[in-house]
Amino acid sequence: EPPTACREKQYLINSQCCSLCQPGQKLVSDCTEFTETECLPCGESEFLDTWNRETHCHQHKYCDPNLGLRVQQKGTSETDTICTCEEGWHCTSEACESCVLHRSCSPGFGVKQIATGVSDTICEPCPVGFFSNVSSAFEKCHPWTSCETKDLVVQQAGTNKTDVVCGPQDRLR
C-alpha cells in the first residue's frame, strides 16, 4: 500500500517517499522505484538553507554600497550573505536592507541616549507625568505643564503623547 506520510527529511511524490536535498543543494530529479533523489550543489553566489525539494537555489543578498551597506558575513552554499551598514550608520530593519544615520523615538517615547558611531538612538517610554508628541533623535520626554503654578486647573489630563490642558478655575459666586 502506498504511503500517505513520509519520515523527516523525506517528501511524498508519486505515492513514494523521496529524500529531500540537503542544505546547499537543489533538486534535479525526484527519486523513482529504482533511483535515489538527484541533487546538485548550489552555484557560486547561491544558497539553500534547509532540507528542500527546490529546483532553484536562492541568490545571495547583495550588500549595495550605494545604500551604505557592506558585507558583514559572506554567504555560503547553506547561508545567505549578512549585510551591515558603514560605520556610523544603522540598519533600518533586522534584514538590514538600507541604512539610516540614526533612528528616531516615536511620540510617547523620549531619547535616553543619542546615537553614536557604534550604537543607534536609545529610546525610553515617557513615564507618568511626562510626554513626547514628536518623532525625534534628540528630544527627551517633557514634563506635563503644572497648571497649579499658573493658578489654573487641569481641564484635560495629559498622556504619554500629550501635555495636560490647563483652564481657569471655576469661580464660586
Partner: nanobody, 116 residues
Framework: EVQLLESGGGLVQPGGSLRLSCAAS????????MWWVRQAPGKGLERVSA????????YYADSVKGRFTISRDNSKNTLYLQMNSLRAEDTAVYYC?????????RGQGTLVTVSS
Amino acid sequence: EVQLLESGGGLVQPGGSLRLSCAASGFTFRDYEMWWVRQAPGKGLERVSAINPQGTRTYYADSVKGRFTISRDNSKNTLYLQMNSLRAEDTAVYYCAKLPQLFHDRGQGTLVTVSS
C-alpha cells in the same frame, strides 16, 4: 529626490569663525528635525548639533557646546551652523542631515580646516 547641499567650509585659523549653510530640496523642510554631523580624517561620524522642525529646541554635543549655534530658516529651506572659537579638533567634513536620513540621500559635505 532629496537633496542636501552644504557650503561655507574653508580654511580658518584657530579662534576664528565660519558659518555653514545647508540648502535643502525634495522634501518639506519645515516638517523635519535637522542635524549637523561631522567626520574628521580617519575618524567616525560625530553628531554635532540638531534642531527641531520649528527651530525652538536644539541639541549640541559637549565638544561644541557654547561655541556652535544651529539655526534654520524654514522660508528659505536652509539650515545653518555658526561656528565660533574654532579649534584644530573641529577640522572635519561637515554634513547636514534630515530625520530620518537615508545613506543614499546624504549630501557631499563641506570641508572645514582649522590650522595656523
